[in-house]
């Protein structure tokens, strides 16, 4: 690595992955093992993210860049660059301090994290329940039979029940 | 998930009777009236009456007399009777509440 | 019986453009309930046509937002804001007002 001559900051022309060397007359030197410098001009290289116990690591660290963290399986992500694993629960339940519960009637959790929520309202919208909620699953809303067709009261009253292939009386 | 699903013979020979059965999942034929269409190949839907949710029913009037509609809402059936099959009977026939259709079932009307 | 005219026949777009399909009934399609009964369809090679519009222009569960319907009486209209090629296929017009009930002839959107 050659010897800064910036007449402003020497420092500024050491690009990331090294760091200005004051104990070497700011010459830029690459950054020691597991550390890491994401920009030009740093004076010092940041350590490392270490992916420990629940934590597995998803992008190993390079001079460049930090380590990216993600959870071992039945384990989530929280927080920014995933600060936090949380333990995952079955689709139809939420995390409590008490561990996983199944989701109260009426509400429902699509995912393995997060809480139940409530099944949507269809009234609130002048439709009707298609399809029932489950634990699982939110309610499918559609039109209701009014909004399909006006219905048998509609049309004349239909013929007698009959077999086909007698006319109708 | 809704579903309707049509089961019929696939092949009938001319002058022959017709029955399909529709099969539906996840609602109620006592809520929704359900209707049966027709498509030539080739060519556009044709109604061909409908059993209302009550469980009354109407016919197309060019099939009025050979046709016959009627379910069973406790085994979530619905069955379609037409007689005296002609070769232009040949279509695909489709039950749906309008708002779901079932995949059709193929009736080929021939010697 | 209604008649059902749909006009064009075939509508030739490119992606991304913005079509319009336009649906004729020989009477009026308001029910004396006040209700107008009038659907539209896509039917794509091979399969059983899924409904887009239902009572003239309320949004089908899962029909994406691109899809419009507007109109009364007996002139209705279908507009894709813009066209994707999954939209690609027959457009039929249904009503279900009076028995029996009819259906248009069908408009086939196809690539320009």
């Known amino acids: 690595f050659e010897r800064t001559r910036s007449l402003q900051d020497p420092c500024s022309n050491c690009p990331a992955g090294t760091f200005c060397d004051n104990n070497r007359n700011q010459i830029c030197s690459p950054c020691p093992p597991n550390s890491f410098s994401s920009a030009g001009g740093q004076r010092t290289c940041d350590i490392c993210r270490q992916c420990k116990g629940v934590f597995r690591t998803r992008k190993e660290c390079s001079s460049t860049s930090n380590a990216e963290c993600d959870c071992t399986p039945g384990f989530h992500c929280l927080g920014a660059g995933c600060s936090m694993c949380e333990q995952d629960c079955k689709q139809g339940q939420e995390l409590t301090k008490k561990g996983c519960k199944d989701c109260c009637f009426g509400t429902f959790n699509d995912q393995k994290r997060g809480i139940c929520r409530p099944w949507t309202n269809c009234s609130l919208d002048g439709k009707s329940v298609l399809v029932n909620g489950t634990k699982e699953r939110d309610v499918v809303c559609g039109p209701s039979p009014a909004d399909l067709s006006p219905g048998a009261s509609s049309v004349t009253p239909p013929a007698p029940a009959r077999e086909p292939g007698h006319s109708p009386q | 998930q809704v579903q309707l699903k049509e089961s019929g013979p696939g092949l009938v020979a001319p002058s022959q009777s017709l029955s399909i059965t529709c099969t539906v999942s996840?609602?109620?034929?006592?809520?929704?009236?359900l209707s049966w269409i027709r498509q030539p190949p080739g060519k556009g839907l044709e109604w061909l009456g409908v059993?209302?949710?009550?469980?009354?029913?109407n016919y197309n009037s060019a099939f009025m007399s050979r046709l016959s509609i009627s379910k069973d809402s406790s085994k979530s059936q619905v069955f379609l009777k037409m007689n005296s099959l002609q070769t232009d009977d040949t279509a695909i026939y489709y039950c749906?509440?309008?708002?779901?259709w079932g995949q059709g079932t193929t009736l080929t009307v021939s010697s | 019986d209604v008649v059902m005219t749909q006009t064009p026949l075939s509508l030739p777009v490119s992606l991304g453009d913005q079509a319009s399909i336009s649906c004729r009934s020989s009477?009026?399609?308001?029910?004396?309930?006040?209700?107008?009964?009038l659907h539209w369809y896509l039917q794509k090679p091979g399969q059983s046509p899924k409904l887009l519009i239902y009572?003239?222009?309320n949004r089908f569960s899962g029909v994406p937002d691109r899809f419009s319907g507007s109109g009364s009486g007996t002139d209705f209209t279908l507009k894709i804001s813009r066209v994707e090629a999954e939209d690609l296929g027959v457009y039929f017009c249904?009503?279900?007002?009076?028995?029996?009930?009819?259906f248009g002839g069908g408009t086939k959107l196809e690539i320009k």
């Open positions: 749906t509440t309008v708002h779901y």
């Open positions: 996840d609602f109620s034929l006592t809520s929704y009236d």
């Open positions: 059993i209302w949710a009550g469980g009354g029913t």
């Open positions: 009477q009026s399609l308001v029910h004396s309930n006040g209700n107008t009964y």
């Open positions: 009572k003239v222009s």
């Open positions: 249904s009503q279900s007002t009076h028995v029996p009930w009819t």
